[in-house]
Protein backbone atom coordinates (compact mmCIF):
# COMPACT_ATOMS: atom_id res chain seq x y z
CA UNK A 1 0.00 0.00 0.00
CA UNK A 2 0.85 3.71 -1.11
CA UNK A 3 -1.10 6.51 0.97
CA UNK A 4 -0.21 9.84 -0.07
CA UNK A 5 -2.02 12.91 1.40
CA UNK A 6 -1.37 15.63 -1.95
CA UNK A 7 -1.83 18.89 0.31
CA UNK A 8 -0.79 18.35 4.05
CA UNK A 9 -0.97 21.82 4.92
CA UNK A 10 -5.00 23.46 5.77
CA UNK A 11 -6.36 26.37 6.80
CA UNK A 12 -9.92 27.32 7.00
CA UNK A 13 -12.23 29.40 9.13
CA UNK A 14 -14.69 28.49 11.15
CA UNK A 15 -17.85 26.98 10.20
CA UNK A 16 -16.38 26.59 6.50
CA UNK A 17 -16.03 23.31 4.65
CA UNK A 18 -12.59 21.38 4.24
CA UNK A 19 -11.51 18.35 2.45
CA UNK A 20 -8.68 16.66 3.47
CA UNK A 21 -7.51 14.97 0.59
CA UNK A 22 -5.99 11.35 0.88
CA UNK A 23 -5.47 8.38 -2.10
CA UNK A 24 -4.26 5.46 -1.54
CA UNK A 25 -2.68 2.76 -4.41
CA UNK A 26 -2.37 -1.14 -3.63
CA UNK A 27 -0.02 -3.74 -5.40
CA UNK A 28 -3.05 -6.13 -5.10
CA UNK A 29 -6.71 -5.75 -4.31
CA UNK A 30 -8.43 -8.64 -4.23
CA UNK A 31 -10.44 -7.20 -1.11
CA UNK A 32 -11.23 -3.52 -0.58
CA UNK A 33 -9.45 -1.90 2.43
CA UNK A 34 -10.06 -0.04 5.50
CA UNK A 35 -9.91 3.69 5.38
CA UNK A 36 -9.01 4.83 8.76
CA UNK A 37 -9.08 8.55 9.30
CA UNK A 38 -7.51 9.47 12.76
CA UNK A 39 -7.13 12.89 14.90
CA UNK A 40 -4.71 13.65 17.30
CA UNK A 41 -4.20 17.74 18.51
CA UNK A 42 -1.04 19.71 17.63
CA UNK A 43 2.12 18.49 19.60
CA UNK A 44 2.43 22.48 20.02
CA UNK A 45 0.65 25.83 19.04
CA UNK A 46 1.52 27.04 15.63
CA UNK A 47 -0.29 30.32 15.89
CA UNK A 48 1.84 31.07 19.33
CA UNK A 49 4.82 29.96 17.35
CA UNK A 50 4.08 32.14 14.92
CA UNK A 51 3.47 34.91 17.41
CA UNK A 52 6.25 34.89 19.71
CA UNK A 53 9.02 33.05 17.64
CA UNK A 54 11.93 33.97 20.22
CA UNK A 55 9.79 31.72 22.96
CA UNK A 56 12.41 29.13 24.50
CA UNK A 57 10.24 26.25 23.37
CA UNK A 58 10.56 27.60 19.83
CA UNK A 59 14.38 27.90 20.39
CA UNK A 60 14.98 24.30 21.88
CA UNK A 61 12.58 23.17 18.27
CA UNK A 62 14.89 25.23 15.86
CA UNK A 63 17.89 23.16 17.48
CA UNK A 64 16.40 19.36 17.18
CA UNK A 65 14.80 20.54 13.32
CA UNK A 66 18.53 21.28 12.98
CA UNK A 67 19.56 18.17 14.17
CA UNK A 68 17.09 16.25 12.00
CA UNK A 69 15.39 17.74 9.04
CA UNK A 70 12.45 15.91 8.89
CA UNK A 71 11.23 16.14 11.79
CA UNK A 72 7.97 17.99 12.53
CA UNK A 73 7.31 19.23 16.50
CA UNK A 74 4.15 19.87 15.84
CA UNK A 75 2.84 16.59 14.89
CA UNK A 76 6.15 14.30 16.61
CA UNK A 77 5.02 14.00 19.89
CA UNK A 78 4.20 10.54 22.23
CA UNK A 79 0.27 10.11 21.94
CA UNK A 80 -0.08 10.22 25.63
CA UNK A 81 0.26 13.92 26.04
CA UNK A 82 -2.16 14.90 23.28
CA UNK A 83 -5.62 14.08 22.20
CA UNK A 84 -6.30 10.89 19.97
CA UNK A 85 -9.53 10.46 18.51
CA UNK A 86 -11.03 8.24 15.31
CA UNK A 87 -12.79 10.71 13.10
CA UNK A 88 -14.09 8.30 10.18
CA UNK A 89 -13.80 4.81 8.95
CA UNK A 90 -14.91 3.42 5.96
CA UNK A 91 -15.11 -0.20 4.21
CA UNK A 92 -16.54 -0.42 0.87
CA UNK A 93 -19.09 2.02 0.87
CA UNK A 94 -19.71 2.40 4.52
CA UNK A 95 -18.45 4.94 6.40
CA UNK A 96 -18.55 5.11 10.25
CA UNK A 97 -18.13 7.82 12.37
CA UNK A 98 -15.95 7.85 15.69
CA UNK A 99 -18.21 8.35 18.47
CA UNK A 100 -16.67 12.21 19.23
CA UNK A 101 -18.12 13.03 15.71
CA UNK A 102 -21.64 11.56 16.04
CA UNK A 103 -24.04 13.91 14.56
CA UNK A 104 -21.52 15.81 12.51
CA UNK A 105 -21.57 16.30 8.67
CA UNK A 106 -17.99 14.62 8.39
CA UNK A 107 -17.77 11.83 5.68
CA UNK A 108 -15.10 9.88 3.91
CA UNK A 109 -15.09 10.08 0.15
CA UNK A 110 -13.56 9.63 -3.16
CA UNK A 111 -10.75 7.28 -2.31
CA UNK A 112 -10.27 8.24 0.98
CA UNK A 113 -10.27 11.90 1.05
CA UNK A 114 -11.71 13.12 4.73
CA UNK A 115 -14.83 16.01 4.27
CA UNK A 116 -16.24 18.35 6.80
CA UNK A 117 -19.16 20.20 5.40
CA UNK A 118 -18.58 22.53 8.13
CA UNK A 119 -15.42 22.60 10.70
CA UNK A 120 -15.38 23.39 14.39
CA UNK A 121 -13.82 24.63 17.41
CA UNK A 122 -11.46 21.75 18.28
CA UNK A 123 -10.94 20.32 14.54
CA UNK A 124 -7.43 21.81 14.28
CA UNK A 125 -4.84 19.36 14.55
CA UNK A 126 -3.34 16.55 12.60
CA UNK A 127 -5.11 14.37 10.53
CA UNK A 128 -3.75 10.53 9.89
CA UNK A 129 -4.80 8.25 6.80
CA UNK A 130 -4.14 5.43 7.33
CA UNK A 131 -5.20 2.18 5.11
CA UNK A 132 -5.46 -1.08 6.27
CA UNK A 133 -5.14 -4.73 3.68
CA UNK A 134 -4.46 -8.30 5.21
CA UNK A 135 -3.48 -8.59 1.82
CA UNK A 136 -1.43 -5.72 1.22
CA UNK A 137 1.39 -5.26 3.99
CA UNK A 138 3.97 -3.57 2.55
CA UNK A 139 5.02 0.08 1.47
CA UNK A 140 3.94 3.12 3.82
CA UNK A 141 -0.22 2.83 5.01
CA UNK A 142 -0.19 5.97 6.46
CA UNK A 143 -0.20 10.02 5.89
CA UNK A 144 -1.01 12.90 7.24
CA UNK A 145 -2.34 16.26 7.28
CA UNK A 146 -2.28 19.49 9.26
CA UNK A 147 -5.63 21.54 9.56
CA UNK A 148 -6.32 24.98 11.56
CA UNK A 149 -9.12 26.37 11.93
CA UNK A 150 -9.31 30.24 12.33
CA UNK A 151 -11.63 32.31 13.77
CA UNK A 152 -10.62 35.44 11.64
CA UNK A 153 -9.66 35.72 8.28
CA UNK A 154 -7.20 38.11 8.64
CA UNK A 155 -2.89 37.26 7.93
CA UNK A 156 -3.00 33.46 7.24
CA UNK A 157 -0.84 33.85 4.78
CA UNK A 158 1.67 35.69 6.92
CA UNK A 159 1.18 33.53 10.17
CA UNK A 160 1.26 30.55 8.55
CA UNK A 161 3.59 30.10 5.97
CA UNK A 162 3.03 27.09 3.77
CA UNK A 163 -0.61 26.43 4.81
CA UNK A 164 -3.05 26.36 1.78
CA UNK A 165 -6.22 28.68 3.38
CA UNK A 166 -9.70 27.47 2.61
CA UNK A 167 -12.85 29.66 2.00
CA UNK A 168 -12.25 32.59 3.61
CA UNK A 169 -15.94 33.83 3.18
CA UNK A 170 -18.19 34.44 6.20
CA UNK B 1 13.43 41.06 35.27
CA UNK B 2 10.55 41.52 32.72
CA UNK B 3 8.53 44.76 33.47
CA UNK B 4 5.73 45.53 31.42
CA UNK B 5 4.23 49.39 32.77
CA UNK B 6 0.91 50.78 30.97
CA UNK B 7 0.12 54.34 30.68
CA UNK B 8 -2.82 56.47 29.30
CA UNK B 9 -5.55 55.41 31.43
CA UNK B 10 -8.45 58.25 32.49
CA UNK B 11 -11.54 59.60 32.35
CA UNK B 12 -13.41 60.16 28.71
CA UNK B 13 -16.76 61.01 27.55
CA UNK B 14 -18.76 58.82 25.60
CA UNK B 15 -17.62 58.55 21.83
CA UNK B 16 -14.44 60.21 22.69
CA UNK B 17 -10.88 58.10 21.89
CA UNK B 18 -7.85 57.10 23.91
CA UNK B 19 -4.33 55.55 23.66
CA UNK B 20 -3.08 53.49 25.97
CA UNK B 21 0.81 52.11 25.81
CA UNK B 22 2.67 49.59 27.21
CA UNK B 23 6.12 50.15 27.80
CA UNK B 24 8.25 46.69 27.91
CA UNK B 25 11.71 46.30 29.66
CA UNK B 26 13.44 43.35 30.58
CA UNK B 27 13.33 41.14 27.41
CA UNK B 28 13.51 41.23 23.59
CA UNK B 29 9.99 43.19 23.01
CA UNK B 30 10.65 42.45 19.17
CA UNK B 31 10.37 39.00 19.63
CA UNK B 32 7.32 38.27 21.30
CA UNK B 33 3.33 38.28 20.37
CA UNK B 34 1.79 40.83 23.02
CA UNK B 35 -2.15 40.90 24.49
CA UNK B 36 -3.79 43.39 26.03
CA UNK B 37 -6.46 41.74 28.46
CA UNK B 38 -9.36 44.16 30.31
CA UNK B 39 -10.75 43.60 33.47
CA UNK B 40 -14.40 45.68 34.81
CA UNK B 41 -14.96 47.15 37.97
CA UNK B 42 -15.75 43.64 40.48
CA UNK B 43 -15.83 41.59 37.05
CA UNK B 44 -13.84 39.17 35.67
CA UNK B 45 -10.82 39.11 32.77
CA UNK B 46 -11.96 39.43 29.59
CA UNK B 47 -9.16 39.30 26.66
CA UNK B 48 -9.13 42.28 24.12
CA UNK B 49 -6.42 41.79 21.17
CA UNK B 50 -3.26 40.33 20.33
CA UNK B 51 -0.35 41.08 17.87
CA UNK B 52 2.43 39.48 16.46
CA UNK B 53 5.99 39.90 17.46
CA UNK B 54 6.58 42.33 14.24
CA UNK B 55 2.88 43.61 14.10
CA UNK B 56 1.88 41.52 10.75
CA UNK B 57 -0.68 39.88 12.73
CA UNK B 58 -3.82 41.16 15.17
CA UNK B 59 -6.74 39.35 16.55
CA UNK B 60 -9.49 41.63 18.17
CA UNK B 61 -12.07 40.27 20.59
CA UNK B 62 -15.64 40.88 18.93
CA UNK B 63 -16.49 43.23 21.59
CA UNK B 64 -13.88 45.82 20.49
CA UNK B 65 -13.47 45.09 16.54
CA UNK B 66 -13.72 47.91 14.31
CA UNK B 67 -13.01 50.23 17.45
CA UNK B 68 -9.57 49.33 18.90
CA UNK B 69 -6.42 48.99 17.67
CA UNK B 70 -3.54 47.06 18.84
CA UNK B 71 -0.02 48.11 17.21
CA UNK B 72 3.61 48.40 18.58
CA UNK B 73 6.58 50.12 17.93
CA UNK B 74 9.43 47.50 18.29
CA UNK B 75 11.89 50.33 18.09
CA UNK B 76 10.77 51.82 21.45
CA UNK B 77 9.94 48.59 22.97
CA UNK B 78 6.04 49.78 23.27
CA UNK B 79 2.64 48.27 22.63
CA UNK B 80 -0.40 50.09 22.02
CA UNK B 81 -3.63 50.17 22.35
CA UNK B 82 -6.07 52.79 20.54
CA UNK B 83 -9.74 52.77 21.59
CA UNK B 84 -12.32 54.98 19.66
CA UNK B 85 -15.98 55.26 19.72
CA UNK B 86 -15.76 54.52 23.30
CA UNK B 87 -18.69 52.85 25.75
CA UNK B 88 -19.59 52.66 28.94
CA UNK B 89 -18.88 49.13 29.27
CA UNK B 90 -15.09 49.84 28.19
CA UNK B 91 -14.74 51.08 31.71
CA UNK B 92 -12.19 48.67 32.56
CA UNK B 93 -8.21 48.09 34.17
CA UNK B 94 -6.45 47.42 30.96
CA UNK B 95 -3.60 44.81 31.58
CA UNK B 96 -1.16 44.25 28.89
CA UNK B 97 0.42 40.65 28.71
CA UNK B 98 4.25 39.28 27.16
CA UNK B 99 3.58 36.25 25.26
CA UNK B 100 0.53 34.16 24.18
CA UNK B 101 0.61 31.93 27.39
CA UNK B 102 0.63 35.58 29.04
CA UNK B 103 3.56 34.92 31.57
CA UNK B 104 3.88 38.12 32.12
CA UNK B 105 1.38 41.11 32.95
CA UNK B 106 1.25 44.78 34.03
CA UNK B 107 0.10 46.72 36.80
CA UNK B 108 -2.56 48.17 34.60
CA UNK B 109 -4.01 50.93 34.06
CA UNK B 110 -7.65 52.47 34.62
CA UNK B 111 -9.93 53.61 31.80
CA UNK B 112 -13.16 55.06 32.86
CA UNK B 113 -16.04 55.84 30.07
CA UNK B 114 -18.31 58.47 31.65
CA UNK B 115 -20.21 61.55 30.65
CA UNK C 1 -20.88 33.25 21.11
CA UNK C 2 -18.31 31.29 22.94
CA UNK C 3 -18.78 30.37 26.62
CA UNK C 4 -15.70 29.17 29.08
CA UNK C 5 -17.44 27.91 32.43
CA UNK C 6 -15.38 27.61 35.45
CA UNK C 7 -17.12 26.81 39.45
CA UNK C 8 -18.05 29.96 40.41
CA UNK C 9 -16.65 29.51 44.07
CA UNK C 10 -14.52 26.03 46.09
CA UNK C 11 -13.92 26.22 49.66
CA UNK C 12 -10.71 24.09 50.98
CA UNK C 13 -9.04 23.47 54.06
CA UNK C 14 -5.63 24.38 54.44
CA UNK C 15 -3.40 21.78 53.26
CA UNK C 16 -5.99 20.02 51.53
CA UNK C 17 -6.57 19.47 48.34
CA UNK C 18 -9.08 21.36 45.66
CA UNK C 19 -9.32 20.60 41.91
CA UNK C 20 -11.06 23.98 39.44
CA UNK C 21 -12.85 23.01 35.89
CA UNK C 22 -12.92 24.34 33.00
CA UNK C 23 -15.54 23.74 30.16
CA UNK C 24 -16.06 24.89 27.17
CA UNK C 25 -19.74 25.85 25.20
CA UNK C 26 -18.36 24.66 21.89
CA UNK C 27 -17.62 20.74 23.21
CA UNK C 28 -14.58 18.93 24.86
CA UNK C 29 -11.51 20.55 25.90
CA UNK C 30 -8.52 18.89 24.33
CA UNK C 31 -4.85 20.18 24.60
CA UNK C 32 -5.13 21.80 21.27
CA UNK C 33 -7.21 24.50 22.87
CA UNK C 34 -4.28 25.30 25.04
CA UNK C 35 -5.84 25.63 28.23
CA UNK C 36 -3.97 28.31 30.27
CA UNK C 37 -4.65 28.93 34.10
CA UNK C 38 -4.08 32.57 35.99
CA UNK C 39 -4.03 33.49 39.54
CA UNK C 40 -5.33 36.93 41.28
CA UNK C 41 -5.62 37.66 44.18
CA UNK C 42 -7.49 41.26 44.90
CA UNK C 43 -5.79 44.52 44.54
CA UNK C 44 -3.06 42.48 42.88
CA UNK C 45 -2.39 42.30 38.68
CA UNK C 46 -3.18 38.90 37.50
CA UNK C 47 0.29 36.07 37.26
CA UNK C 48 0.35 32.81 35.37
CA UNK C 49 0.10 29.88 36.45
CA UNK C 50 -0.06 26.71 33.93
CA UNK C 51 0.06 27.11 29.91
CA UNK C 52 -0.35 24.51 27.45
CA UNK C 53 -2.65 22.37 30.09
CA UNK C 54 -0.15 21.28 32.38
CA UNK C 55 3.67 23.39 31.63
CA UNK C 56 4.22 25.28 35.10
CA UNK C 57 6.21 28.56 34.87
CA UNK C 58 9.35 28.86 36.98
CA UNK C 59 7.89 30.53 39.24
CA UNK C 60 4.60 28.43 39.93
CA UNK C 61 4.85 26.38 42.89
CA UNK C 62 4.61 22.78 42.84
CA UNK C 63 1.50 22.01 44.56
CA UNK C 64 -0.31 23.68 41.31
CA UNK C 65 -0.88 21.12 38.54
CA UNK C 66 -3.02 21.46 35.40
CA UNK C 67 -4.13 18.35 33.26
CA UNK C 68 -7.26 17.29 30.95
CA UNK C 69 -9.89 15.45 33.04
CA UNK C 70 -13.04 14.60 31.15
CA UNK C 71 -14.18 16.96 28.48
CA UNK C 72 -12.61 19.96 30.90
CA UNK C 73 -9.44 21.45 32.02
CA UNK C 74 -8.72 21.06 35.86
CA UNK C 75 -6.42 23.08 37.94
CA UNK C 76 -5.29 20.94 41.04
CA UNK C 77 -3.91 22.87 44.48
CA UNK C 78 -2.37 19.87 46.58
CA UNK C 79 -1.62 21.20 50.16
CA UNK C 80 -3.57 23.94 50.21
CA UNK C 81 -1.91 27.42 51.40
CA UNK C 82 -3.66 30.21 52.98
CA UNK C 83 -1.91 32.34 50.28
CA UNK C 84 -3.26 30.53 47.43
CA UNK C 85 -6.77 32.12 48.12
CA UNK C 86 -6.81 34.46 45.56
CA UNK C 87 -9.20 34.48 42.31
CA UNK C 88 -8.43 31.72 39.86
CA UNK C 89 -8.99 31.94 35.79
CA UNK C 90 -9.16 29.60 32.78
CA UNK C 91 -8.16 30.81 29.41
CA UNK C 92 -8.87 28.94 25.79
CA UNK C 93 -6.93 29.58 22.36
CA UNK C 94 -10.14 29.52 19.61
CA UNK C 95 -8.13 29.76 16.65
CA UNK C 96 -6.80 33.46 17.20
CA UNK C 97 -9.66 34.49 19.70
CA UNK C 98 -8.86 33.72 23.37
CA UNK C 99 -11.89 33.20 25.95
CA UNK C 100 -11.41 33.51 29.39
CA UNK C 101 -14.05 31.84 32.15
CA UNK C 102 -15.87 33.64 34.51
CA UNK C 103 -13.31 32.27 37.51
CA UNK C 104 -12.98 30.36 40.94
CA UNK C 105 -13.08 32.10 43.95
CA UNK C 106 -11.12 29.27 46.02
CA UNK C 107 -11.79 30.20 50.07
CA UNK C 108 -8.91 28.98 52.28
CA UNK C 109 -10.91 28.31 55.66
CA UNK C 110 -9.27 29.21 58.68
Known amino acids: IQVTVSDPYHVVILFQPVTLPCTYQMTSTPTQPIVIWKYKSFCRDRIADAFSPASVDNQLNAQLVAGNPGYNPYVECQDSVRTVRVVATKQGNAVTLGDYYQGRRITITGNADLTFDETAWGDSGVYYCSVVSAQDLEGNNEAYAELIVLGRTSGVAELLPGFQAGPMED | EVQLVESGGGVVQPGRSLRLSCAAS????????MHWVRQAPGKGLEWVAVISYDGSNKYYADSVKGRFTISRDNSKNTLYLQMNSLRAEDTAVYYCAKDLNMDYWGQGTLVTVSS | QTVVTQEPSLTVSPGGTVTLTCASS?????????PTWIQQKPGQAPRALIHTTSYKHSWTPARFSGSLVGDKAALTLSGVQPEDEAEYYCLLQYGGAWVFGGGTKVTVLG
Open chain 2, 26 to 33: GFTFSSYG
Open chain 3, 26 to 34: TGAVTSGYY
